[in-house]
């Protein structure tokens, strides 16, 4: 069962996560970002199911497509080069999600645009936040 | 509605000048990126250049750098093409697009005006 | 340079299916739009992100999207339906903006 120290260090880390996805959307959808258009060109895959930390190995698979959307963005968007907070954002992921079972993503059939998907991966994070307060 | 009306375009002798306009009207014009976008006669769409909504960043073809200026007035709602060194190859119908903020294509066109270079 | 590649005609007769493709290398993780452009007027959004249609636009108008390959398909095609189709994406890396050459749809 999980001791309340493991469950506050979870809570922490889904927090971290939230305001890394918050504030790479927020440096995206501005109509101050000269590259927004070009960026809605990139097409994300959607978990089809993600109400368990487990779903997180779906974000994992994105956060390539997630980096190469982000080189498009002017340095000044974001605090840290785009590897950097895509690195930042995959440790806190393979924390949270366990390498212990190996859980095969099942996608959506619609794709996303990258203000959909980062929507929908602040949604899960802040659903799972809302069961562990 | 949402509109952007084009002018200037007419027949210019090689290695000249032509500025075009597009005015816009119906959305707040200043919270937009815009695009010149090209069109030979009887071939396809060329994007030729881009600016920020704020005039600070601009992009341009390969084909036009060097040649081409973009810039806008934002207090006249107005977007411009500034051609410098005509050549043949730029005969075609020039059109401003507006870059969509919620899609990633050109959202909104002008009427297009028609630029032919012949000496 | 970045291509997309589209067949340069196509001609149907009215009630017919007509299907127009538009190959890039990107669209497995690219987004493909899709413009109608009749005789001398503006290009019109018809498709956008691969299937969704712009409010106005007939239902008649869908898209489709798979591996390298991007598909308009115009179900029972009107004579008003005749125009020029261009598909529109980006680069691999998102830099560059692309057209397709265009598809020239007769339908008599």
């Known amino acids: 069962a999980p001791t309340s120290s493991s469950t506050k260090k979870t809570q922490l880390q889904l927090e971290h996560l939230l305001l890394d996805l918050q504030m790479i959307l927020n440096g995206i959808n501005n109509y101050k970002n000269p590259k927004l258009t070009r960026m809605l060109t990139f097409k994300f895959y959607m978990p089809k199911k993600a109400t368990e930390l487990k779903h997180l190995q779906c974000l994992e698979e994105e956060l390539k497509p997630l980096e190469e959307v982000l080189n498009l963005a002017q340095s000044k968007n974001f605090h840290l080069r785009p590897r950097d907070l895509i690195s930042n954002i995959n440790v806190i992921v393979l924390e949270l999600k366990g390498s212990e079972t190996t859980f095969m993503c099942e996608y959506a059939d619609e794709t996303a645009t990258i203000v959909e998907f980062l929507n929908r991966w602040i949604t899960f994070c802040q659903s799972i936040i809302s069961t562990l307060t | 509605q949402v509109q952007l009306v084009q002018s200037g375009g007419g027949v210019v002798q090689p290695g000249r000048s032509l500025r075009l306009s597009c005015a816009a009207s119906?959305?707040?014009?200043?919270?937009?990126?815009m695009n010149w976008v090209r069109q030979a006669p009887g071939k396809g769409l060329e994007w030729v250049t881009s600016?920020?909504?704020?005039?600070?960043?601009?992009e341009y073809a390969d084909s036009v750098k060097g040649r081409f200026t973009t810039s806008r007035d934002n207090s006249k709602n107005t977007l411009y093409l500034q051609m410098n060194s005509l050549r043949a190859e730029d005969t075609a119908v020039y059109y401003c697009?507006?870059?969509?903020?919620?899609?990633?294509?050109?959202?909104?066109w002008g009427q297009g005006t028609m630029v032919t270079v012949s000496s | 340079s970045y291509e997309l590649t589209q067949p340069p005609s196509l001609s149907v007769s009215p009630g017919q299916t007509a299907t127009i493709s538009c190959s890039g290398d990107?669209?497995?993780?690219?987004?493909a739009y899709w413009y109608q452009q009749k005789s001398g007027q503006a290009p019109v959004l018809v498709i956008y992100?691969?299937?969704r249609r712009p409010s106005g636009i007939p239902e008649r108008f869908s898209g489709s999207s798979s591996g390298t390959m991007a598909t308009l398909t115009i179900s029972g095609a009107q004579v008003e339906d005749e125009a020029d189709y261009f598909c529109?994406?980006?680069?691999?890396?998102?830099?560059?903006?692309?057209f397709g050459g265009g598809t020239k749809l007769t339908v008599l």
């Open positions: 992100e691969d299937t």
């Open positions: 119906g959305f707040t014009f200043s919270n937009y990126a």
């Open positions: 600016i920020s909504y704020d005039g600070a960043n601009r």
């Open positions: 697009a507006r870059d969509s903020t919620t899609l990633g294509a050109f959202d909104v």
């Open positions: 990107a669209f497995p993780r690219k987004f």
């Open positions: 529109y994406s980006t680069d691999t890396t998102g830099t560059h903006r692309v």
